[in-house]
């Protein structure tokens, strides 16, 4: 049942959600499978139904409580199992003892807005969503700006090595349409990864004043 061809990866959003992806070569397509969570020091259990995301991978979200409730701490260990139905029983297909704060992936930043825009610069702010108070200021951000004629992959990454929920973009071209994205990562956790990118924020720089050098 539990074997090396199975990959089972989960991340904690630092508040009340554990998202899991399970992939297995040759897994049965029609079988009903779920993720079961059993914390070592709490009285609740939780399950979610695995839904297909590709030919051989499934995903689900364990909702542990209200979005901003702190359901796990740095000392918790949660036994996570992939269970697939065989007849009337559920077979263990994969298992891991999961340390939530070693496997963090926060929600994408939200509420991006243009605070101030000029011909060559733009000040943008954002907020973090459902992030634990445990982090205090121990977060970092990456941002990128999409310029005309380029792709997101070509956009240089701007790194903010502190909890700074704003940025001033410089050396922009006047009267030009841009898009901006940001993502966040806690400094804590051996297997912690970047949040998804935020929804892009579109903005346009102001045109250069007539008769003035740009």
């Amino acid at each position: 049942a539990v074997n090396g061809t199975s990959q089972f990866t989960c991340f904690y959003n630092s508040r009340a959600n554990i998202s899991c992806v399970w992939s297995q070569d040759g897994a049965l397509q029609d079988t009903s499978c779920q993720v079961h969570a059993w914390p070592d020091r709490r009285r609740w259990n939780q399950t979610c139904e695995l839904l297909p995301v590709s030919q051989a991978s499934w995903a689900c979200n364990l909702i542990l409580g209200a979005p901003d409730s702190q359901k796990l701490t740095t000392v918790d260990i949660v036994t996570l199992r992939v269970l697939c139905r065989e007849g009337v029983r559920w077979r263990v297909m994969a298992i891991q003892d999961f340390k939530p704060f070693e496997n963090l992936r926060l929600m994408a930043p939200i509420s991006l807005q243009v605070v101030h825009v000029e011909t060559h610069r733009c000040n943008i702010s954002w907020e973090i969503s459902q992030a634990s108070h445990y982090f205090e200021r121990h977060l970092e951000f990456e941002a990128r700006t999409l310029s005309p004629g380029h792709t997101w992959e070509e956009a240089p990454l701007l790194t903010l090595k502190q909890k700074q929920e704003w940025i001033c973009l410089e050396t922009l071209t006047p009267d030009t349409q841009y898009e901006f994205q940001v993502r966040v990562k806690p400094l804590q956790g051996e297997f912690t990864t970047w949040s998804p990118w935020s929804q892009p924020l579109a903005f346009r720089t102001k045109p250069a004043a007539l008769g003035k050098d740009t």
Epitope: A1, V2, N3, R81, L83, W90, I95, D97
Partner: nanobody
């Protein structure tokens, strides 16, 4: 039915060592994970160390570097080598086995570890 039998507990001075053993017997076809849990009086149960069928180990942060989990598949046994013991390690240590089916969860009776001078 599966039985788990722990041994090796006792009284030890701070800084001392103990090795706990857990032997699984009965109708064991396959296990997905074996683990040691502990519970001190008035405290929550906590996972101390675990090992899956593919050999992945996890240790609680409070014991990492001091405790070592090992297994002998031929004897259906896991061992917990506990070094540099502290008074806060005092607890009843219980062995747990999760089988290949979701309803296969087995516990030992537990063995008491007391760390005191």
């Amino acid at each position: 039915q599966v039985q788990l039998q722990e041994s090796g507990g006792g009284l030890v001075q701070p800084g001392g060592s103990l090795t706990l053993s857990c032997v699984a017997s009965g109708s064991i076809l396959e296990m997905s994970r074996m683990a040691w849990y502990r519970q001190a009086p008035g405290k929550q149960r906590e996972l101390v160390a675990s090992i899956t069928s593919i050999g992945s180990k996890v240790y609680a942060d409070s014991v990492k570097g001091r405790f070592t989990l090992s297994r002998d598949n031929t004897k259906n046994t896991i061992y917990l080598q506990m070094n540099s013991l502290k008074p806060e390690d005092t607890a009843v240590y219980r062995c747990n086995l999760l089988g290949t089916w979701s309803d296969e969860t087995y516990w030992g009776q537990g063995t008491l570890v007391t760390v005191s001078s």
